[in-house]
Structure formats: C-alpha cells, structure tokens
C-alpha cells in the first residue's frame, strides 16, 4: 500500500539532486585550488543531513551548520557583489571581473544555485514530487533556510565598499522582502563596511531617468544610513555596454556614459 505523501505547493526536489550536488562540488574544487582540500562526499553527507528525515517546514539554520563548516571559504571581503532580482547580469559581471564575487561564486552558493530540495519527516526519502512554497506553505523550508543562512554569512564577511546590483525595471527596485532587503542589508557590519554602492540597472534602451532617486532607493539609503554605513548609487544606463567595458575598459565605447 503506497504511503500517503504530503502535497506541497512548490515544485519538488530537482531531479538527480544528489548527483548534481556531488558533481558540482567536484567541479568547483577542481577549478578553485584553495578549496581542493574539501571532501565532496562529506559535503554531500552534511548537505543531506540538514534536511533528510526532517519536517520540511521545521528546518533551522543550526541544521546547516555542519555544511557551513565544511564549506568555509575566504573571499576578498572588499570584492563582494550582492544582487537582487538581476542574477544573470551579476553572474555575467563576475565571470568577466574575476576578482569580484557573488554568493554563487562561492562553493556553497555554487552547489545550490537554481536547485530545489526537501525531505520528509521520519523517512530517509527525498521528496521529488513537491516541496514547500515560501509563501503558500512555510518560510522555514530547506531551500529558504539555506539561502538565508549562506546570505547572512556572506554579508557578514563583507568589508570596505560593498556593491549591490539592482533591477531598475522592477516596480520595487529595492524590495525589503527580497533576500538582499531582508537578510543581507541587515547583516552588513558597520565596523567593517564603509559604503554600500547600489548599481541600478536600466532595462529600456532610451531610459535616461535617474533611478537613484526612486522612492525605494531612498528607502534603502535610509536603512543603510541608520546603520552608520555610507550609501551611494550609480545608474547603469546601458548594461550591455557596461559588460563590454568590464571586458575591455580601454574600448572606445567606454568613453561615453555607460
């Protein structure tokens, strides 16, 4: 008789999840010499241990601590790029500007990027049918808690000038409910971080508005200033041109406003 299985509102665990995590770990540690010491089987065991046999609405940051410990990594604290609702451009940027890092350029972020996972209470099975949705089901689900944990640690590690890429095409350019707005902003350390610089990425070709004056950006400035961190903002009017100039700053197209 088939066991009754909880139906959640979100998509189930990504197919071949264990194999994907293990393969990504091996690939990452091969490419990044400073992480060669990492034992990927132990990483997978710690990852699995965070959510297997646990109720997927009752996951805590403590569940992920063994994984966090194994994935401890030092990135240059002054070369951190945060992003909100504009992941692809942020990743294209760090693929060219190799000495800057998004969370997904670290081992733990790389392992989990774009994946979904959850287990079931009291069974060792992975649930490939459905997983809890953050809004419709519960916020303390395995995926949300993972990203909250790694995002907090990433923000805590930042120093000097921290950059954040924001999507100027969204109705809320800065969204207090995003991971950036709810976790990272509040975990920047004022004794280490001097400035948060926002890069507002324009979508329209002929959009010459100063989106740094947007009410949500002013809200971000207020939150950051109250935390004793300077705030600055830059419009990126032409993201395609910006990437071109990152690739080659000597390019003649970089002589005009990006």
């Amino acid at each position: 008789v088939p066991r009754w299985r909880q139906q959640w509102s979100g998509p189930g665990t990504t197919k071949r999840f264990p194999e994907t995590v293990l393969a990504r770990c091996v690939k990452y540690t091969e490419i990044h010499p400073e992480m060669r010491h990492v034992d990927c089987q132990s990483v997978w065991d710690a990852f699995k241990g965070a959510f297997i046999s646990k109720h997927p609405c009752n996951i805590t940051e403590e569940d992920y601590q063994p994984l966090m410990k194994l994935g401890t990594q030092t990135v240059p604290c002054n070369k951190i790029l945060l992003w909100s609702r504009i992941k692809d451009l942020a990743h294209q940027f760090t693929q060219v500007q190799r000495d800057m890092f998004t969370l997904e350029d670290t081992l733990l972020g790389y392992l989990a990027d774009d994946l979904t996972w959850c287990g079931e209470f009291n069974t060792s099975k992975i649930n490939y049918q459905s997983c809890p949705d953050w809004r419709k089901d519960c916020s303390n689900n395995p995926v949300s808690v993972f990203w909250k944990t790694v995002s907090r640690r990433f923000a805590e590690a930042a120093c000097d000038v921290v950059h954040v890429m924001l999507n100027g095409s969204r109705s809320k350019i800065f969204d207090k409910n995003s991971t950036f707005g709810s976790v990272e902003v509040h975990n920047l350390q004022p004794e280490k971080v001097q400035t948060l610089e926002a890069w507002v990425i324009h979508g329209g070709r002929e959009d010459s508005r100063d989106l740094c004056q947007d009410p949500t950006i002013k809200e971000l400035e207020s939150i950051i200033s109250k935390r004793n961190i300077q705030f600055s903002c830059k419009n990126i009017y032409r993201p395609d041109k910006f990437l071109q100039c990152v690739k080659n700053p000597e390019d003649s197209s970089c002589t005009s406003e990006i």
Epitope: N78, M100, V161, T195, E197, W199, C254, E257
Partner: nanobody
Amino acid sequence: EVQLVESGGGLVQAGESLRLSCAASGRTFTNLGMGWFRQAPGKEREFVAADTWSGTSTWYGDSVKGRFTISRDNAKNTVYLQMNNLKPEDTAVYYCAARLRGWITTRKPNEYDYWGQGTQVTVAS
C-alpha cells in the same frame, strides 16, 4: 588615454588649509573612479582618499580621516582634495589617480590605471 593634471600645491604653515585640484580629460569622467595618493621622500606611495564610482561616497586613509575631503565636479571633469589642519607629516608629493574600472573602489595604487605628474605640498612647523 586619460590625462590628469594636478594643481594647488604649495608651502603652508601647520594648521592651515590647501585645496588640490585634478582635471581629467580623455574619458567620460563619470565612468572613472578617482583617488589621491601621496609620497614622502624615501617612503612608499600612501593612499589618501578615493571616491566610489558614483562620486557620492568617499573613503580615506587613517592618517587624514576627519581633516581631508575628496569631492568631484562631474561638469568640470575635476576631482578635489580639500586639506584642513595640515601637519608637517602631511608634507609629500600628492598624486591624483584614475581607475578605468570605476566599479572597483580600492586603496591599492596598482589598481589605478592613470596618474598625474604630482604636486608638492610642504607644511612648515
């Protein structure tokens, strides 16, 4: 190619003020990150101040914090260094520097691409 021309150096008494200017040409100024460094005889080049790419945020070397202010006028393609309450130990050649990669804010001289010829600041006690 970016050209940087500093001006405003000179001889002053301790406690007095000076304002250095650095005029940039050859690039869109708003794409550049700007900084000031100084070098005293027999010493390494030392970070003084820099602004972020937007020009709206600034940071300083520990020895000048609270006394020096970096600012920029994008309309004039010029960056300034206002130096107050000068001390004899501020005596050095002051250099303006530009980063083509304006998006990286840094205090490392080797991450700046273009340099001015320098202007001498001498503070007498």
